[in-house]
């Protein structure tokens, strides 16, 4: 019995299409596959950012695979051919590994790259990113922001830069169509006549950095002699009611502070007839049903009641 062997894939490479971290891994079939014409060859692909402890593993029949990477670090990948047991009258046969790496040659020292990058997707409508210039860079240094997400033909540059002392320190993004629930890639590079500037790469998903507007139209309704219902409305904008969590702060007679987190636009408060003043504020955040993370809104305007009308049916500001 001759031992069945198979070659690794050919021309294994990592291709950068200019999408700021979304890379193509591609290869060609191995040599000498003539013996296995009736067989569907599979490939086991392993890849990771250099420095990561774990490999991502994919088994595919295709000759390419795409995924996002952190271009601040290098990338390593390896692939081998798999012959399923059906093709070999027995156990699965694997080729040796073909390996490849990819990295962007870093320009400039790390301190020249932008510092404290911060991006917020206000009310799921307006993306604003801001940063601080690199440490020790001169005023002639300017930074440029590029972004890409699946659906764009190519990476786009920021339309509206925020400036300080003539330097770009932020970006207001234009309308971003169909951009949530997918990776959003950003590169901030720079130029200076004095020294090279290190580029920085960032990846996030927009729904996870949403800061909603605060709730509006806060009202009180007396439900019973010892219960008051606090109500409010979702803010104007594209975020549906089902996506909100709320945090309430309630003060009774300037002493008791109640805080609560609720999923609906109402909260029922137990009170006594002795209550002379009631104030509350609410803030909102996108909940776990619509995102993995989020930013609390500012607090709403305070809604207060003072006097003896707390026993009446409805109390508005």
């Amino acid at each position: 019995d001759t031992e069945i062997k198979v070659n690794p894939p050919q021309d294994f490479e990592i291709v950068d299409p200019g999408y700021l971290g979304y890379l193509y891994l591609q290869w060609q079939p191995p040599l000498s596959l003539d013996h296995f014409k009736e067989c569907t060859v599979e490939y086991e692909l392993k890849y990771r950012n250099i420095g990561s402890e774990t490999w991502k593993t994919i088994i595919t029949k295709n000759l390419h695979y795409k995924d996002g990477f952190d271009l601040n670090k290098g990338i390593e990948a390896k692939i081998h051919t798999l012959l399923p047991w059906q093709c070999t009258n027995g156990s699965e046969v694997q080729s040796s590994w073909a390996e490849t790496t990819y990295w962007i040659s870093p320009q400039g020292i790390p301190e020249t790259k932008v510092q404290d990058m911060d991006c917020v997707y206000y009310n799921w409508q307006y993306l604003l990113c801001s940063w601080k210039p690199g440490i020790g860079v001169l005023l002639d240094t300017n930074y440029n922001l590029f972004y890409w997400y699946e659906g764009l033909d190519h990476a786009l540059q920021c339309v509206d830069y925020i400036k300080a002392d003539g330097q770009n320190i932020g970006c207001r993004f234009p309308y971003l169509e169909a951009s949530d629930y997918k990776d959003f890639y950003i590169c901030v590079n720079g130029s200076s006549e004095n020294k090279p500037i290190r580029s920085s790469y960032f990846t996030f998903q927009l729904q996870n950095i949403v800061k909603p507007l605060p709730p509006v139209y806060l009202t009180f309704t007396r439900e019973s002699s010892c219960e008051i219902k606090l109500k409010w409305s979702i803010p104007l904008g594209p975020i549906p009611a089902r996506c909100f969590d709320y945090e309430i702060e309630i003060r009774e007679d300037d002493t008791t502070l109640v805080t609560a987190t609720v999923e609906n636009e109402t909260y029922t408060l137990k009170t006594t007839n002795e209550t002379r003043q009631l104030c509350f504020v609410v803030r909102s955040k996108v909940n776990i049903y619509c995102s993995d993370d989020g930013i609390w809104s500012e607090w709403s305007d305070k809604q207060c009641w003072e006097g003896e009308d707390l026993s009446k049916k409805t109390l508005l500001r």
Partner: antibody, heavy 119, light 111 residues
Framework: QVQLVQSGAEVKKPGASVKVSCKAS????????MNWVRQAPGQGLEWMGR????????DYNQNFKDRVTITRDKSASTAYMELSSLRSEDTAVYYC????????????WGQGTSVTVSS | EIVLTQSPATLSLSPGERATLSCRAS??????????MNWYQQKPGQAPRLLIY???RQGSGIPDRFSGSGSGTDFTLTISRLEPEDFAVYFC?????????FGGGTKLEIK
């Protein structure tokens, strides 16, 4: 509830200056550009300039030849537009109007401030 | 500066009809894959109201009967079925470059 509340009507003599204020509320003042637009009686709209409250960066319409000055007080969420060397053709309603970046247009407008220039 | 020419200057139509307003720019207002063209409605004694931004995106709270189209130098605002409250003056505006400029306006009046 976004609101832009402008200062009251003004009557000025030719050669004088006028300063119009615009108090913003209901949103984060520094996140949006603030534009100034004027409209002479029965006429169209004329963009005068804009300020980025985030950093104070300003763009002017050069048609006003250094007569216009736009400023902001971030702590008071207020923008100001001052027009100097007034002439009769500056008689108009002056609007402040916010917009998020150049690709979004101008989505909220103040109620307008009437400025009359007459001797 | 970019000059915007609106046509017609006046448009007389009846409620229920379709209105088509045109705006032509003296040079392209496209950049970064975006058309920097906006449309506003203004009624007497009121501030303008944003209808359409980036040529085709509806402003907040704008009814679906308002739509925008076009790119480069030629843009159109369409009101699919006129309501009585739609009779007003409509302005186009470019925000591609400073100074931002407005068209002269189209007055939409009841026939």
């Amino acid at each position: 509830q976004v609101q832009l509340v402008q200062s009251g009507a003004e009557v000025k003599k030719p050669g004088a200056s006028v300063k119009v204020s615009c108090k913003a509320s209901g949103y984060t003042f520094s996140n949006y550009l603030m534009n100034w637009v004027r409209q002479a009686p029965g006429q169209g709209l004329e963009w005068m300039g804009r300020i980025d409250p985030y950093d104070g960066d300003i763009d002017y319409n050069q048609n006003f030849k250094d007569r216009v000055t736009i400023t902001r007080d971030k702590s008071a969420s207020t923008a100001y537009m001052e027009l100097s060397s007034l002439r009769s053709e500056d008689t108009a309603v002056y609007y402040c109007a916010r917009g998020y970046g150049t690709a979004y247009g101008v989505d909220y407008w103040g109620q307008g401030t009437s400025v009359t220039v007459s001797s | 500066e970019i000059v915007l020419t609106q046509s017609p200057a006046t448009l007389s139509l009846s409620p229920g009809e379709r209105a088509t307003l045109s705006c032509r720019a003296s040079e392209s207002v496209d950049n970064y894959g975006i058309s920097f063209m906006n449309w506003y409605q203004q009624k007497p004694g009121q501030a303008p109201r944003l209808l359409i931004y980036a040529a085709s995106r509806q402003g907040s709270g704008i009814p679906d009967r308002f739509s925008g189209s076009g790119s480069g130098t030629d843009f159109t605002l369409t009101i699919s079925r006129l309501e009585p409250e739609d009779f007003a003056v409509y302005f186009c505006q470019q925000s591609k470059e400073v100074p931002w400029t407005f068209g002269g306006g189209t007055k939409l009046e009841i026939k």
